[in-house]
């Protein structure tokens, strides 16, 4: 399995962001496909579970990403992307996308570095 991501993503505080992760595989995509998304915070704290897909999508039942993430992928199109809603500044960090598609061997885990930035104020727009 080979994984492709946007590597770097900038999004405005309070908005939603699509974390894009696509993949290629020698094996056909079927019921064995799994996708796991995790998050490594900027402060070096423990990695956190974000999302899981296996036949159906599954949100985390606890923690900061509860009720804030949804599946936006399409396995038949080799897309394992997710949507993260209502971005907060402490969502800054690295999101990892891990795709397993047996019997293909696991590939390198894809990474996206998300930067959540301030909403552009009207005065700043006027100044620009």
């Amino acid at each position: 399995v080979e994984i492709y991501t946007s590597r770097v993503l900038e999004a405005v505080n309070g908005t939603d962001a699509r974390l894009k992760c696509t993949f290629s595989s020698f094996a056909p995509v079927g019921d064995a496909l799994t996708v796991t998304w995790n998050f490594r915070p900027l402060d070096g704290g423990p990695e956190q579970f974000v999302f899981y897909y296996h036949i159906d999508p599954f949100q985390p039942m606890s923690g900061r990403f509860k009720d804030r993430v949804s599946w936006d992928g399409n396995p038949e199109r080799y897309d394992a992307s997710i949507l993260l809603w209502k971005l907060q500044f402490d969502d800054n960090g690295t999101y990892t996308c891990q795709v397993k598609n047996p019997p293909d061997v696991d590939g390198v885990i894809g990474e996206i570095r998300l930067s959540v930035v301030h909403t552009v104020r009207f005065s700043e727009i006027h100044f620009l």
Epitope: G45, Q48, F49, F58, S62, R64
Partner: antibody
Amino acid sequence: QVQLVQSGSELKKPGASVKVSCKASGYTFTNYWMHWVRQAPGQGLEWIGEINPTNGGTDYNEGFTGRFVLSVDKSSSTAYLQISSLKAEDTAVYYCTIYTTALDYWGQGTLVTVSS
Amino acid sequence: DIQLTQSPSFLSASVGDRVTITCRASSSVGYMYWYQQKPGKAPKPLIYVTSNLASGVPSRFSGSGSGTEYTLTISSLQPEDFATYYCQQWSSNPPTFGQGTKLEIK
């Protein structure tokens, strides 16, 4: 490194109350929800509930509503489990644990013994 | 609540053996966690979301499954693996644990 340090063992009489503390260090306290798990002597694990340290929001297992109260003190990065109207069947080890990719980090456990 | 039933409840095995523990759910769950617990100690995570190894866990541990049936496999038992193992589901609230499987030295 992440550490969860719990208060010491307690011996209480039926009907009394107990407050178990769990002091967190090595991570940003408000970034991870705190969970409490009970293990009666020689028995399995039961989830009591969870608390969001950012806003104090709680979610309890149905069997633990009423007498069990979770709280946090953000200033000291400490979580608390208070049990009121103690019964003999509350005798157990109580663990605090944070949810990361699983319940990855656990306190050492606090034995609460309820006996007359 | 979803009930999890582990089998076997007790298991005797020798160092080097391949061991499989099964966890059956009363209704379909999306994924499973596995923990190891030694006497007097807190549980330690082994597997998260069905098949992912927790940090620092040796590769002889593996997890698989879907729906109502999940398995934990230890490919070659080591002396330090003798302990009690618990499965846990969290694709529906409240999270629930299996009753445990005690793995003993034969």
